[in-house]
Amino acid sequence: SSCGQVKCRKGEQCVHTASGPRCFCPSPRDCESGCASSPCQHGGSCHPQRQPPYYSCQCAPPFSGSRCELYTAPPSTPPATCLSQYCADKARDGVCDEACNSHACQWDGGDCSLTMENPWANCSSPLPCWDYINNQCDELCNTVECLFDNFECQGNSKTCKYDKYCADHFKDNHCDQGCNSEECGWDGLDCAADQPENLAEGTLVIVVLMPPEQLLQDARSFLRALGTLLHTNLRIKRDSQGELMVYPYYGEKSAAMKKQRMTRRSLPGEQEQEVAGSKVFLEIDNRQCVQDSDHCFKNTDAAAALLASHAIQGTLSYPLVSVVSESLTPERTQ
């Protein structure tokens, strides 16, 4: 129905008021819901109304505005403090102390975050995004620099339906369509063998407490586990000779031990230095990610930071010690 210049939508009635003609919805059931367009941002809940704009938003703090579009900083929030002396003594000892596992304590000086003291260093959101890993979407953290809000804005809860089967058949050069989904790691790219690779810039350099032979034996599971966290696919980089770049890692105390061995090299029966783990160089292949998602890592910097964030949360399933993003083609260094 219409009244004068005002055009009313389906199910609405025209009412003449003191301030002129207005549209009114006598029964919200019969009218187009203003909530249909999901106007409420940042997790606000939408309630249909009888008058324009036919919805009202109930905003979750710290947001306000008719569409919860405004961020309001809480009044003078005191900065989080660190258990100063206790944590100063514990920082950078190579073991994560939960009492110091906070942004204010640089995640125990990097001990809880794969040696990365600030995974959110490039995040310019007004929100402290490290505090918003909360199983709900926080759009202000949903950027690559803010680590995609830990993938909480795109159905993070989706799990691989045939997980055991898909794990057993991951990256086995046979396409299993039941595993060819983001949550199942796109079957390790088995179904995209004919597509061109789409490599992110840079290399992830990871130290893991598994000797090279064990890591290579378990490579498919390892790549699947990390790929699941990063919502993309990973592969072990090859050197100029085509060899997989997985090298023995001799641990943090290696410099002193090497020095000691140099002076005693000629002694008979000298044992070789013990391997503490592996240093593995990984590449990100986004060929499937870019088809299914706009949350793909264009370079390895944020991917490394996201792994550090998982270390902070304690959600890594492998004994990772450190992660670094290398921009240039690395020389083989130990």
Epitope: Y86, G94, C96, E98, D111, C112, L209, A276, L316
Partner: antibody
Amino acid sequence: EVQLVESGGGLVQPGGSLRLSCAASGYTFSSYGMSWVRQAPGKGLEWVSYIYPYSGATYYADSVKGRFTISADTSKNTAYLQMNSLRAEDTAVYYCARHSGYYRISSAMDVWGQGTLVTVSS
Amino acid sequence: DIQMTQSPSSLSASVGDRVTITCRASQSVRSFLAWYQQKPGKAPKLLIYRASIRASGVPSRFSGSGSGTDFTLTISSLQPEDFATYYCQQYYISPWTFGQGTKVEIK
């Protein structure tokens, strides 16, 4: 199967020394922290010391600081507790226990050895 | 150091009873609390970690709850093999400290 076996306990005079060993098997030794926990006869549990074999980080209870030294040999998958200047109040069953989280000191102890008795008496 | 106080220090119960043991920390330990069961002459056994997560192989009659300073271990239906001493332990701030123990005896 993950297993811890302690050895080295015995009778020692006050002021004496003893070295306890904890042989680990069934898991990657360097990836998990290890603690020593003791229990005096008829008493409760008391945490003594912790080591993370990979980094060599060590922690001690105040009651043993300066007298006890924890160490680990990753080539032998064994943790040690060197106990010096022993006192009568150190008499207890000593257990070694593995921490459940990789590199996380703040994790529960999920595997325990059978214990070894240390008696300090003249 | 953080003090852990368990109550009661002992209790008598019958098979099938519901048993509740409480543990209070002198300051917040968030959810970094474990419960252990110990039988005479044996090593402790981990039952619950992170305040409420059952360790592998632990029967579902054991449950844990709480966070901050107040925690509870509940045995929903006591079985003959559950008669033992139970300890809580905080592993938030070192030195890690145990409660004094709660002995569950047969009535």
